[in-house]
């Protein structure tokens, strides 16, 4: 769930995912349009569509609880737990270091970036 | 080999509290990924999971249920234990243990032990 | 929770014919997994991920399915098939199994 991932991002990248990435260019935040504005933003929209394909798999990616361990700057998803949980943790893990391996271009520009401003194409998934 | 082995009261009150004791052996609940659960079946019906118990005691219950289950663990003694507070007829079932591995489901299950609840 | 539904609840077959057995569930799981259970014992595990046979298992036998629709199927009904099968799914929590089905030797 939400929970997971704040908790899970902040452990990663050392920021604050509500004051640092959610919201963060056109698509780190709740839902998510046109172009990727920078490297974090693409983590971003990569993870929504991670998610997407959870949802298509029935699964309750708001609500879903999963365990974890962090020890050593590393996620270990833990194979407890229901498949969606699983998979949910996997997507989580994978945004969180895609954040902490783009920490050298994030702009603080791009916190808060007003939506209308995001044009063209949506990446696909 | 892997084998359990379940144990409980036989009969009870309604109200009362039930213990079941799952003994193992074949396998370790200190090893990574390894879990128990309890399972029951009312006789001529179907199977209904009730709690699960991992290796370093994170513990799943049915959300049915949970206000009313104890699931425990003695990994020295390979025992694991279910307790159902205030129980009433609707609680005559076979209990099983079964362990689960690292997969979605149950490789091994214990024979079952028949619980009645007299009203 | 995910409610599994099997179809049908009750069936007989002859020795040799071809049987399939059905688990419908109320959204769309990863994988699907069945145990067969005869009167007096506890639940043998039968097929697992879906489509993989448990050890000990005949080849006769065969999963399939995807999304919210898999199946069970005996290529020849022999005697010792008789049993109830059950399928059982972990894609989210809680975990949940189907209410079975009881297959008869007609």
């Known amino acids: 769930g939400i929970l997971n991932l704040n908790k899970m991002v902040k452990q990663v990248t050392g920021k604050m995912p509500i004051l640092s990435y959610w919201p963060y260019g056109c698509h780190c935040g709740l839902g998510g349009r046109g172009q990727p504005k920078d490297a974090t933003d693409w983590c971003c929209q990569t993870h929504d569509c991670c998610y997407d394909h959870l949802k298509t798999q029935g699964c309750s990616i708001y609500k879903d609880y999963y365990r974890y361990n962090f020890s050593q700057g590393n996620i270990h998803c833990s194979d407890k737990g229901s498949w969606c949980e699983q998979q949910l943790c996997a997507c989580d893990k994978e945004v969180a270091f895609c954040l902490k391996r783009n920490l050298d271009t994030y702009q603080k520009r791009l916190r808060f970036y007003w939506r209308p401003h995001c044009r063209g194409q949506t990446p696909g998934c | 080999q892997v084998t359990l082995k379940e144990s409980g009261p036989g009969i009870l009150q309604s109200s009362q509290t039930l213990s079941l004791t799952c003994s193992f052996s074949?396998?370790?609940?200190?090893?990574?990924?390894?879990?128990v659960s309890w399972i029951r079946q009312p006789s001529g019906k179907g199977l209904e999971w009730l709690a699960h118990i991992y290796w370093d005691d994170d513990k799943r219950y049915n959300p049915s249920l949970k206000s009313r289950l104890t699931i425990s663990k003695d990994t020295s003694r390979n025992q694991v234990f279910l307790k159902i507070t205030s129980v009433d007829t609707a609680d005559t079932a076979t209990y099983y243990c079964?362990?689960?591995?690292?997969?979605?489901?149950?490789?091994?299950w214990g024979q079952g032990t028949l619980v009645t609840v007299s009203a | 929770q995910i409610v599994l539904t099997q179809s049908p609840a009750i069936m007989s077959a002859s020795p040799g014919e071809k049987v399939t057995i059905s688990c419908s569930a109320s959204s769309s799981v990863s994988y699907m997994y069945w145990y067969q259970q005869k009167p007096g014992s506890s639940p043998k595990p039968w097929i697992y991920?879906?489509?993989n046979l448990a050890s000990g298992v005949p080849a006769r036998f065969s999963g399939s399915g995807s999304g919210t629709s898999y199946s069970l199927t005996i290529s020849s009904m022999e005697a010792e098939d008789a049993a109830t099968y059950y399928c059982q799914q972990y894609h989210s929590s809680p975990l949940t199994f189907g209410a079975g089905t009881k297959l008869e030797l007609k």
């Open positions: 074949g396998f370790s609940l200190s090893t990574s990924g390894m879990g």
């Open positions: 991920r879906t489509s």
């Open positions: 079964a362990r689960k591995h690292s997969d979605y489901w149950f490789a091994y």
